[in-house]
Amino acid sequence: PHLRTFTDHFQTCKVQGAWPLIDNNYLNVQVTNTPVLPGSAATATSKLTIIFKNFQECVDQKVYQAEMDELPSAFADGSKNGGDKHGANSLKITEKVSGQHVEIQAKYIGTTIVVRQVGRYLTFAVRMPEEVVNAVEDRDSQGLYLCLRGCPLNQQIDFQAFRANAESPRRPAAASPSPVVPETFPYETAVAKCKEKLPVEDLYYQACVFDLLTTGDVNFTLAAYYALEDGKMLHSNKDKLHLFERTRELPGAVA
Amino acid sequence: CKILKCNSEFWSATSSGSHAPASDDVPEFCAALRTYALCTRRTARTCRGDLAYHSAVHGIEDLMSQHNCSKDGPTSQPRVRTLPPAGDSQERSDSPEICHYEKSFHKHSAAPNYTHCGLFGD
């Protein structure tokens, strides 16, 4: 999937299986990614588990779990708030669109999470105070906390190189992310579809084009669109909302 | 269609969730079931063609017969779970300041800096 980190780095990761997205003193978010096509390195999120840890007189431990075709509007125990503690309403789930869009407000940690199902796959977005982001007991254990450190270099897909291949008149038979590039989506069509929803040619737009070329699934246009919309709602600095291409940076201290 | 609201109200009224009630709780459980049934009837016109509505109706019928609940009888108000020490209103609030990050943060610092992370697509 495409990852926008807390430090506004934008990466395309092929991380397959279960990976920690956030892991701090208050919250643990784990995603499971699966290949979008047989033999493809490109993956998308098929499962998401969020654990809100027990916190003072505010909330009991609560687990939220979403999977493909199952986006619940309640925690795993059926509740919609933080339990029986005095400040339980400082954690709340709101169903925005049934089966498609859920918002979780964790006021006790100043955090808002948006989970969506777009097409077959899930999207995740979070707004969190820096103080909470950095609240980690063991700094060494942060190695693979994707939202903070990005994905390891060996798990990144260079989609700028892929795009250069796609733009060239004769597309190579096997572009690295996906050996089976669906011929149903010529580059021009992908560009037109993405332009429709994402008029600014930023990295969300580039991600959209990449996704259409690798899968042929138009739902990925909406995934990029909603990711940008969620960014509009959740990003504190509106000037940094649109990210543009830059020379790729190595993620800090990741193997 | 508000059938999900009926479902969640029933769930919160029977705090043991889907587990069978203890025998001394049966009258209370039946009252909650009757409330649930009334709630579903009140959504019938806008939910009548939806699976969630029919599942709820059949579920209620099954639970009514399992627990020998009569169709007529008292209904219950959704339970408000008891809160720690008195002096608080019935409706639970976010009361402790510690449970509202921004309020407690402002006590000792300027407004917090927020960050954003997102994951999407392939």
Epitope: - | K2, L38, G49
Partner: antibody
Framework: EVQLVESGGGLVQPGGSLRLSCAAS????????MNWVRQAPGKGLEWIGM????????HYADSVKGRFTISRDNSKNTLYLQMNSLRAEDTAVYYC????????WGQGTMVTVSS | DVVLTQSPLSLPVTLGQPASISCRSS???????????LEWFQQRPGQSPRLLIY???SRFSGVPDRFSGSGSGTDFTLKISRVEAEDVGVYYC?????????FGQGTKLEIK
């Protein structure tokens, strides 16, 4: 995102037949009742009928009863409206809409009944 | 059959001003279990109808809070607290309490 796309409209002679389709995506089609609604040119909305999630019940407006039949194929996520014995007054844009009472609507397909 | 009568049929409003549309039913829309099933739809020029309000007063997902619904029995009202340019279009009330379901004849909102 809920999407409903109607198709099958066109020009038909009085007394003729037409079958409209509505392709649904972005929600679990087999869980919801579905409606058909129409709108004659320059006029208001008219409810045509609805079908339950499992096709167990169908309800129709008096104006189309006996002439129109609503059906669905949950395996194909598709809703249908079979229109027989068409009259000039059936000329309209036909919309399909999700839910036992309509919440999300398609863009509509135009049916013109004329000789 | 239930007949819904809307008034006014045409409503010219100044931007930023409030607007109110009435919907009267030929019989009560409250069913025997106490539910009242009245909805309001907006149809912008050239577009499909869009659900604004259901069950008399519940705002549908994504509908701005300047829209509100009220009423009971046979008299219902849709209010727009401050009209914006994008609110131009035709507004329909719709009842789901009695078969066959039915729409009002529509109220056209335009900017003065």
């Amino acid at each position: 995102e809920v999407q409903l796309v109607e198709s099958g409209g066109g020009l038909v002679q009085p007394g003729g037949s037409l079958r409209l389709s509505c392709a649904a995506s972005g929600f679990t089609f087999s869980n919801y009742g579905m409606n058909w609604v129409r709108q004659a040119p320059g006029k208001g909305l008219e409810w045509i009928g609805m079908i339950y999630y499992d096709s167990s019940e169908k309800h129709y407006a008096d104006s189309v009863k006996g002439r129109f039949t609503i059906s669905r194929d949950n395996s194909k996520n598709t809703l249908y409206l079979q229109m027989n014995s068409l009259r000039a007054e059936d000329t309209a844009v036909y919309y399909c809409a999700k839910g036992s009472t309509p919440d999300y609507w398609g863009q509509g397909t135009m049916v013109t009944v004329s000789s | 059959d239930v007949v819904l009568t809307q008034s006014p049929l045409s409503l010219p409003v100044t931007l930023g001003q409030p607007a109110s549309i009435s919907c009267r039913s030929s019989q009560s829309l409250e069913d025997s279990d106490g539910g009242t099933f009245l909805e309001w739809f907006q149809q912008r020029p050239g577009q499909s109808p869009r659900l604004l309000i259901y069950d008399v007063s519940s705002r549908f997902s994504g509908v701005p809070d300047r829209f509100s619904g009220s009423g009971s029995g046979t008299d219902f009202t849709l209010k727009i607290s401050r009209v914006e340019a994008e609110d131009v279009g035709v507004y329909y009330c719709f009842q789901a309490t009695h078969d066959p379901l039915s729409f009002g004849q529509g109220t056209k909102l335009e900017i003065k």
